[in-house]
């Protein structure tokens, strides 16, 4: 008996061939001997089976002695043995229909679990293997689970169902809802305008939800909400914003926030959360602001940074085109009685400059100029 595997919702074509290469009488029946379809000369005839409106044949092949049974929009319950009667012969084909579906939704939040469930006909014992977009293989029986979805899990999952040495392939598109970056750091000189961007790692036609940016300033004892906003069909509208700082927000995606001035009191860490409509859980992106200030007070030239810096960052003070006078893994450095000239304060990571502030030291009879 020939075995054919089908996919739920798809179309399958079961073949039946006569030795005579011409159109002759044929009938397709199911295992209960109920007629599905056949022919009356050049016309199709349909029986009282439950497949009636989903069964068809390919008439262009009849004149070549081929009488296929086409079943559209396959259902699991279409799994059966189908019998083709032609030329006093009977050809039997066993059809097994499988379905593979993702739990509840194919749009999942980062960190959530993905469960794939296999629907199979009674009496079958299939095995399933799925390959994620990043090449990770998972195996299982009726259900397969992947916990802690990551951004790289977005894309097409390819699952192979194996039964009777035959296989059928399913492709399921999974969208992991997340921000492009989990965390970002913005380095700014005091007084500069700060731009925070929160690009999403997915695109959907309609995006609706609400969000909030909580900020923990380094100097503050507790965090506070800087801004709350709504998102409706990709349009952003601000609900509430603090007076200090007075953030501005872009009306379109990607989410974009502007802080008019980088000030030491704003340096710190923020957490932007986005709750999407019809989704449990929230998307998160951490954002950090590091602010630098270079000052000269009497005979002391000081450079300071505020905000979340890693211990391996180096803070230096140097006169232009000269070696650094001072370099420390600290958040403040200074030089007493600095020479006249253009001084540079540098925040660097393994030789790569992250932030730079220049200050001009004038001869002692004049006052300093800060460009």
């Amino acid at each position: 008996k020939k075995v054919v595997l089908g996919k739920k919702g798809d179309t399958v074509e079961l073949t039946c061939t006569a030795s005579q290469k011409k159109s002759i009488q044929f009938h397709w029946k199911n295992s209960n001997q109920i007629k599905i379809l056949g022919n009356q000369g050049s016309f199709l005839t349909k029986g009282p089976s439950k497949l009636n409106d989903r069964a068809d044949s390919r008439r262009s092949l009849w004149d070549q002695g081929n009488f296929p049974l086409i079943i559209k929009n396959l259902k699991i319950e279409d799994s059966d043995t189908y019998i083709c009667e032609v030329e006093d012969q009977k050809e039997e084909v066993q059809l097994l229909v499988f379905g593979l579906t993702a739990n509840s939704d194919t749009h999942l939040l980062q960190g959530q679990s993905l469960t794939l469930t296999l629907e199979s006909p009674p009496g079958s014992s299939p095995s399933v293997q799925c390959r994620s977009p990043r090449g990770k293989n998972i195996q299982g029986g009726k259900t397969l689970s992947v916990s802690q979805l990551e951004l790289q899990d977005s894309g097409t999952w390819t699952c192979t169902v194996l039964q009777n040495q035959k296989k059928v392939e399913f492709k399921i598109d999974i969208v992991v809802l997340a921000f492009q970056k989990a965390s970002s750091i913005v380095y700014k000189k005091e007084g500069e305008q700060v731009e925070f961007s929160f690009p999403l790692a997915f695109t959907v036609e309609k995006l609706t939800g609400s969000g909030e940016l909580w900020w923990q300033a380094e100097r503050a004892s507790s965090s506070k909400s800087w801004i709350t906003f709504d998102l409706k069909n990709k349009e952003v509208s601000v609900k509430r914003v603090t007076q200090d700082p007075k953030l501005q927000m872009g009306k379109k995606l990607p989410l974009h926030l502007t802080l008019p001035q980088a000030l030491p009191q704003y340096a710190g860490s923020g957490n932007l959360t986005l709750a999407l409509e019809a989704k449990t859980g929230k998307l998160h992106q951490e954002v950090n602001l590091v602010v630098m200030r270079a000052t000269q007070l009497q005979k002391n030239l000081t450079c300071e940074v505020w905000g979340p810096t890693s211990p391996k960052l180096m803070l230096s003070l140097k006169l232009e085109n000269k070696e650094a006078k001072v370099s420390k893994r600290e958040k403040a450095v200074w030089v007493l009685n600095p020479e006249a000239g253009m001084w540079q304060c540098l925040l660097s990571d393994s030789g790569q400059v992250l932030l730079e502030s220049n200050i001009k030291v004038l001869p002692t009879w004049s006052t300093p100029v800060q460009p």
Epitope: S23, Q40, G41, S42, F43, K46, D53, R59, S60
Partner: antibody
Framework: EVQLLESGGGLVQPGGSLRLSCAAS????????MSWVRQAPGKGLEWVAG????????YYADSVKGRFTISRDNSKNTLYLQMNSLRAEDTAVYYC?????????????WGQGTLVTVSS | DIQMTQSPSSLSASVGDRVTITCRAS??????LAWYQQKPGKAPKLLIY???SLQSGVPSRFSGSGSGTDFTLTISSLQPEDFATYYC?????????FGQGTRLEIK
């Protein structure tokens, strides 16, 4: 050139019999699905019967099943319709028609028709 | 059996007019539909088959469209010889069935 020519029509009493013939030229009747189609006066077209290939498979409209018999004589290249137990509602012009192939199942050639009148 | 319903039953038009006749099947017949023209006292003549294919020798002013359950026959510019009765017929499942006809008359 394909041609179909019907004959055998006429006036017959209810319950009577009549045999219609359709002589074909330009093709072989035994290689095609052949049909009889009728048209009552002032009415539409109604398929009556069909015969396929060597004549082993015959099909009928429910309205004539058990009363009419379709057949053919390949040697004479002729199609027949034997009509028994005729009723007044069988009064019509009877056409013989050839059906195209399985992939093009349409009546591509028709005869000129023969009138059958069932009346007492 | 599949029922075929034509509309309108009759239609008056003038030479040069564009005319459309519709045919509806009681169930999906894919594209297995033919249109025939019949003149008084004559046999039907095949115009269109497979819903939209023009039978050889039929003028190009005749065209057919549709699939599934809804079909149309269009005559782009009526000629005097086009005044006749038109029938649609399904060939999807046995038995083949015809529409009741549309009589096209001169206005």
């Amino acid at each position: 050139e394909v041609q179909l020519l019907e004959s055998g029509g006429g006036l017959v009493q209810p319950g009577g019999s009549l045999r219609l013939s359709c002589a074909a030229s330009g093709f072989t009747v035994g290689s095609w699905y052949m049909s009889w189609v009728r048209q009552a006066p002032g009415k539409g077209l109604e398929w009556v019967a069909g015969i396929w290939y060597e004549g082993s498979n015959k099909y009928y409209a429910d309205s004539v099943k058990g009363r009419f018999t379709i057949s053919r004589d390949n040697s004479k290249n002729t199609l027949y319709l034997q009509m028994n137990s005729l009723r007044a509602e069988d009064t019509a012009v009877y056409y013989c028609a050839r059906l195209g192939t399985a992939s093009l199942p349409y009546f591509d050639y028709w005869g000129q028709g023969t009138l059958v009148t069932v009346s007492s | 059996d599949i029922q075929m319903t034509q509309s309108p039953s009759s239609l008056s038009a003038s030479v040069g007019d564009r005319v459309t006749i519709t045919c509806r099947a009681s169930q999906d017949i894919r594209s297995y539909l033919a249109w025939y023209q019949q003149k008084p006292g004559k046999a039907p003549k095949l115009l269109i088959y497979a819903a939209s294919s023009l039978q050889s020798g039929v003028p190009s002013r005749f065209s057919g469209s549709g699939s599934g359950t809804d079909f149309t026959l269009t005559i782009s510019s009526l000629q005097p010889e086009d005044f006749a009765t038109y029938y649609c017929q399904q060939s999807y499942t046995a038995p083949p069935t015809f529409g009741q006809g549309t009589r096209l008359e001169i206005k």
